[in-house]
């Protein structure tokens, strides 16, 4: 099939006092092989500080996955989610509040 770029969505949720979990979700992409990873101040976080979901079919012939990490509240601006898929790449900031979701479709 032809390449379908992902929709990337970054959300945040309270984890524990002073900490939040930031989650970067990619959906609707094809083929399955995608890079999704968190950076702090432009430097990649180690694997052991990130949690990944499996790449799963979403029922539409495309795929979805996610990566999450726990960070200190107030440091959100230092973190970005990085995505590579089929020769394209993009970075996605953490939204400033719980109600803000960032959706980006990349071509």
């Amino acid at each position: 099939g032809s390449t379908v770029p992902p929709m990337v969505n970054v959300t945040r949720s309270e984890a524990s006092e002073g900490n939040i979990t930031v989650t970067c979700r990619a959906s609707g992409f094809y083929p399955w092989n995608i890079t999704l990873s968190w950076r702090q101040d432009g430097v990649s976080l180690s694997h052991d500080t990130q949690q990944w979901g499996d790449v799963l079919p979403d029922g539409n012939g495309t795929y979805q996955t996610w990566v999450a990490t726990r960070i200190c509240q107030g440091e959100e601006q230092r973190f970005t989610c990085y995505m590579e898929h089929s020769g394209n790449h993009s970075t996605h900031p953490v939204p400033s509040g719980n109600s803000h979701h960032h959706h980006h479709h990349h071509h």
């Epitope: 092989n33 890079t35 990649s44 180690s46 990944w52 590579e84 020769g87 394209n88």
Partner: antibody
């Protein structure tokens, strides 16, 4: 098919800088990370650093002050520059494509390597 | 940095033998472990990724296992083309680090 090929000076004088080029084919540098790994004679492998598809870099902190990795997407080339070379930088230098899929991160295709000798 | 130790630096085995190469990490690495094969001419090839996954094109006589800090690579039926040095590599924490290698020779 995916290929990587390193080219370097062969011999570098102590205190001088090293420049190595990795030329790739079969994949786009905009969507893949490329790593540099070296191997001193008779020893094991050491990861130096990498450059991501967007040009962002990660370095081995032990060498970060002497290392610079850059690339030219249009020429399909990645460049390693290392300053202030000493004799213990004598090694075979490899570039390798990184595959980073969730929990999996591995170097799936390697170049043949280029030998660099630091000597006066 | 995480230290990777391959206690056996070299071993001799007969063709057809089952060969097991061990690797231990200085701390738990959560299965974030790869194996590479380096031929005498210096050519390096990915053999096993994420502890036990086999890339396409790698013969099924190679297998990997382990958890926590202890991992192993097994060659079930040694063939002449398996003469090489084998390296484990962790990617749990940056920088990725390699073991010192285990050289496999024919008896």
């Amino acid at each position: 098919q995916v290929q990587l090929k390193e080219s370097g000076p062969g011999l570098v004088a102590p205190s001088q800088s090293l420049s190595i080029t990795c030329t790739v084919s079969g994949f786009a540098l905009t969507g893949s990370g490329v790593n540099w790994v070296r191997q001193p004679p008779g020893k094991g492998l050491e990861w130096l650093g990498m450059i991501w598809g967007d040009g962002n870099t990660d370095y081995n902190s032990a060498l970060k002050s002497r290392l610079s990795i850059s690339k030219d997407n249009s020429k399909s080339q990645i460049f390693l520059k290392m300053n202030s070379l000493q004799t213990d930088d004598t090694a075979r230098y490899y570039c390798a494509r990184g595959a980073h899929y969730g929990k999996r991160w591995y170097f799936d295709v390697w170049g043949a390597g280029t030998t660099v000798t630091v000597s006066s | 940095d995480i230290q990777m130790t391959q206690t056996t630096s070299s071993l001799s085995a007969s063709l057809g033998d089952r060969v097991t190469i061990s690797c231990s990490a200085s701390q738990g690495i959560n299965n974030y472990l790869n194996w590479y094969q380096q031929k005498p001419d210096g050519t390096v090839k990915l053999l096993i990724y994420y502890t036990s996954s086999l890339p396409s094109g790698v013969p099924s006589r190679f297998s990997g296992s382990g958890s926590g800090t202890d991992y192993s690579l097994t060659i079930s039926n040694l063939e002449p083309e398996d003469i090489a040095t084998y390296y484990c590599q962790q990617y749990s924490k940056l920088p990725p680090t390699f073991g010192g290698g285990t050289k496999v020779e024919i008896k």
